[in-house]
């Protein structure tokens, strides 16, 4: 659900943290229409996720912790 570098909508699937290697924040006030978390998977896919959903918040926290520990 992305066009060029902007997410236009959100995935309707839930990703397990073990498949995600990183994320990027998309902010609506920085040239895109919606706020989003773009998850980057091990298979080099980019998945647009709703930043207000609980599963997204948990994965962002898990990934942020990983980065700090590196």
């Amino acid at each position: 659900a992305s066009n060029f570098d902007c997410c236009l909508g959100y995935t309707d699937r839930i990703l397990h943290p073990k498949f995600i290697v990183g994320f990027t924040r998309q902010l609506a006030n920085e040239g895109c229409d919606i706020n989003a978390i773009i998850f980057h998977t091990k298979k080099k896919l980019s998945v647009c996720a709703n930043p207000k959903q609980t599963w997204v918040k948990y994965i962002v926290r898990l990934l942020s912790k990983k980065v700090k520990n590196m």
Epitope: H16, P17, N35, K52, Q53, T54, I59, R61, L62
Partner: antibody, heavy 125, light 110 residues
Framework: EVQLVQSGPEVKKPGSSVKVSCRAS????????FSWVRQAPGQGLEWMGG????????IYAQKLQGRLTITADTSTDTAYMELSNLRSGDTAVYYC??????????????????WGQGTLVTVSS | QSVVTQPPSASGTPGQRVTISCSGS????????VNWYQQLVGTAPKLLIY???QRPSGVPDRFSGSKSGTSASLAISGLQSEDEADYYC???????????FGTGTKVTVL
């Protein structure tokens, strides 16, 4: 109706560990976020961390990182909170709580609708 | 100390309207939904308002929530003696990557 039942009160010595259980009944377990919240005597609420059982990996508040372990057993629908290297400042009532909607909900993120009865943990020498 | 602040106390007489403020920042209230909890003395907290302004079933319509920018507020209209309790706002914080509770407000019915 969802119910969360916690283990009983504990008295612990400084430097020891405590493990509190939270058994869920009356609803799906694995796709809901469970949080642990504590409240020291006369103080406010403090979010400690949480777990989505299907994700297996918990998240923790920074200040408790290294001392706190949160786990979930999907075979018994039970969440656990273990706090190690206890100090007097850890004396508090510890609550487990479950979110209103499942982990895909965006309108109920953090909305802790179901709460356990609380477990008083006293740390004293 | 908490990144979300509330006045320590508020009071009113029965029937009055009482409003509790909750002040945060762009990373919490400004970009996430706000939930409100009521805690009666000696009991577990109870979800009072979720998603800024939604009431779970069983919560009287005397309670209402609102949000504007980086602040939120809880209004209790027609204050009753059983409303005497501690009230907490809460939201996810995207900078801290954790859930944060407000400092809490003790409501007294005079």
């Amino acid at each position: 109706e969802v119910q969360l039942v916690q283990s009983g009160p504990e008295v612990k010595k400084p430097g020891s560990s405590v493990k509190v259980s939270c058994r869920a009944s009356g609803g799906t377990f694995s796709t809901y976020a469970f949080s642990w919240v504590r409240q020291a005597p006369g103080q406010g609420l403090e979010w400690m961390g949480g777990i989505i059982p299907v994700f297996e990996t918990p998240i923790y508040a920074q200040k408790l990182q290294g001392r706190l372990t949160i786990t979930a057993d999907t075979s018994t629908d039970t969440a656990y909170m273990e706090l190690s290297n206890l100090r007097s400042g850890d004396t508090a009532v510890y609550y487990c709580a479950r979110e209103w909607g499942d982990y895909y909900s965006s309108v109920s993120s953090g909305a802790l609708h179901y709460w356990g009865q609380g477990t008083l943990v006293t740390v004293s020498s | 100390q908490s990144v979300v602040t509330q006045p320590p106390s508020a009071s009113g007489t029965p029937g009055q309207r009482v409003t509790i403020s909750c002040s945060g920042s762009r990373s919490n209230i400004g970009s996430n939904i706000v939930n409100w909890y009521q805690q009666l003395v000696g009991t577990a907290p109870k979800l009072l308002i979720y998603s800024d302004n939604q009431r779970p079933s069983g919560v009287p319509d005397r309670f209402s929530g609102s949000k504007s920018g980086t602040s939120a507020s809880l209004a209790i209209s027609g204050l009753q003696s059983e409303d005497e309790a501690d009230y907490y706002c809460a939201a996810w914080d995207d900078s801290l990557n954790r859930y944060v509770f407000g400092t809490g407000t003790k409501v007294t019915v005079l």
